[in-house]
Interface confidence: low
């Protein structure tokens, strides 16, 4: 079971999966990607208060040291724990190709 | 080869491995760990400017969207890319035990 899934800041305020719509232009991909024209980018956004979704022992240490030495040690950060694959139709010299990217869309989030 | 190892903010300012000395009391471990009395915690600290040590495609997307929508999308964050194991001598009901933790000390850092 994941450590600390209750967000003390209120529903939806802590580290969780968000969807951000982005065009190929937004991503700087217009010159090499044909499709999709728009990507629903899933990403991990939100605060990581004490022990919320702590990924591992390192995250727990980071929380402790952040409270003691806030000038030196940053708080844990909300990052992907796993990814969903995504297929892009890319432009090539000879036409198009389908390429699967395994590390493009966040699937699940934790604090580290 | 890792993406963007040159720090535009100046030497040592960007995401990299730091060592922070911490006592068992600092970590809240005094009641269950016997040794070591002090831990040299290696952790990832520093800024993640555009494309610096970008871990993957997701990190590159995050950089692009952060520049476009800074109020919505946070900048990439400096987190461990891998860990070094560490052995703790723990107190038990019957005496002591040696326990290896694989996710305690950061070994290498990247931005995600």
């Amino acid at each position: 079971a994941r450590n600390g899934d209750h967000c003390p800041l209120g529903p939806g305020r802590c580290c969780r999966l968000h969807t951000v719509r982005a065009s190929l232009e937004d991503l700087g991909w217009a010159d090499w990607v044909l499709s999709p024209r728009e990507v629903q980018v899933t990403m991990c956004i939100g605060a990581c208060p004490s022990q919320f979704r702590a990924a591992n022992m390192h995250a727990q240490i980071k929380t402790s040291l952040h409270r003691l030495k806030p000038d030196t040690v940053p708080a844990p950060c909300c990052v992907p724990a796993s990814y969903n694959p995504m297929v892009l139709i890319q432009k090539t010299d000879t036409g198009v190709s389908l390429q699967t990217y395994d590390d493009l869309l966040a699937k699940d989030c934790h604090c580290i | 080869a890792r993406n963007g190892d040159h720090c535009p903010l100046g030497p040592g300012r960007c995401c990299r491995l730091h060592t922070v000395r911490a006592s068992l009391e600092d970590l809240g471990w005094a009641d269950w760990v016997l040794s070591p009395r002090e831990v040299q915690v290696t952790m990832c600290i520093g800024a993640c400017p555009s494309q610096f040590r970008a871990a993957n495609m997701h990190a590159q997307i995050k950089t692009s969207l952060h520049r476009l929508k800074p109020d919505t999308v946070p900048a990439p964050c400096c987190v461990p890319a891998s860990y070094n194991p560490m052995v703790l001598i723990q107190k038990t009901d019957t005496g002591v035990s040696l326990q290896t933790y694989d996710d305690l000390l950061a070994k290498d850092c990247h931005c995600i």
Epitope: P8, L9, G10, R13, I45, G46, A47, C48, P49, S50, H66, R67, P70, D71, T72, P74, A75, P76, C77 | L9, G10, R13, A47, C48, P49, S50, H66, R67, P70, D71, T72, P74, A75
Partner: antibody
Framework: EVQLVESGGGLVKPGGSLRLSCAAS????????MSWVRQAPGKGLEWVGM??????TYATWAKGRFTISRDDSKNTLYLQMNSLKTEDTAVYFC??????????????WGQGTLVTVSS | DIQMTQSPSSLSASVGDRVTITCQAS??????LSWYQQKPGKPPKALIY???ILASGVPSRFSGSGSGTDFTLTISSLQPEDFATYYC????????????FGGGTKVEIK
């Protein structure tokens, strides 16, 4: 010694513009989140906005009229204020954020510069 | 937007008194709150970060507590140099709520 020195304040007419500067010394501005805070005469502190490593956030009332920027080569932070109103009369402080994890306390402050908006 | 409400707006106390100032957030901000002290004609000075962490060089008579929506700044034994105005500030900005200050509490000599 770490220091912040604001300048650029003065008298301006309603509807006018002003650009405040905050010169940093003893540290590199580019390594820190920075904020602007203002204080009307005899009143409390009011947060204006913050600049992170590559973006800005503003108080609701400041959006659209105020813009925070910085010039890393000059180690200087700026606050561009447009369409000024009499209620913008205040001492404007720049402040350095102590750390930027998920919380942004202000640890180092300048002495402030007074902006008076009056016809 | 988050609103911060401080009380009382002013108080009179004597040297040696225990002084308590409260700050209430309009919605939960966990422990993401700072306290500042300001003297006339001077910029504010940070006292406490993250609700209870004492800033460097701040005397131990100052302490902070609370989490969620209700926070307290306590001065255990008021000293002459503590007569000033105190402000709380929400420091949570992940969702662009801003970093609003409370209205301030002026601590005066009785």
């Amino acid at each position: 010694e770490v220091q912040l020195v604001e300048s650029g304040g003065g008298l301006v007419k309603p509807g006018g513009s002003l650009r405040l500067s905050c010169a940093a010394s003893g540290f590199s501005l580019s390594n820190y989140y920075m904020s602007w805070v203002r204080q009307a005469p005899g009143k409390g502190l009011e947060w204006v906005g913050m600049i992170s490593f590559s973006g800005t956030t503003y108080a609701t009332w400041a959006k659209g009229r105020f813009t925070i920027s910085r010039d890393d080569s000059k180690n200087t932070l700026y606050l561009q204020m447009n369409s000024l109103k009499t209620e913008d009369t205040a001492v404007y402080f720049c402040a350095r954020v102590v750390y930027a994890g998920w919380t942004y306390p202000l640890g180092i402050w300048g002495q402030g510069t007074l902006v008076t908006v009056s016809s | 937007d988050i609103q911060m409400t401080q009380s009382p707006s002013s108080l009179s106390a004597s040297v040696g008194d225990r002084v308590t100032i409260t700050c209430q957030a309009s919605q939960s901000i966990s422990s993401v709150l700072s306290w500042y002290q300001q003297k006339p004609g001077k910029p504010p000075k940070a006292l406490i970060y993250e609700a209870s962490i004492l800033a460097s060089g701040v005397p131990s008579r100052f302490s902070g507590s609370g989490s969620g929506t209700d926070f307290t700044l306590t001065i255990s034994s008021l000293q002459p140099e503590d007569f000033a105005t105190y402000y709380c500030q929400a420091n949570y900005d992940v969702y662009n709520y801003g970093n609003p200050f409370g209205g301030g509490t002026k601590v005066e000599i009785k």
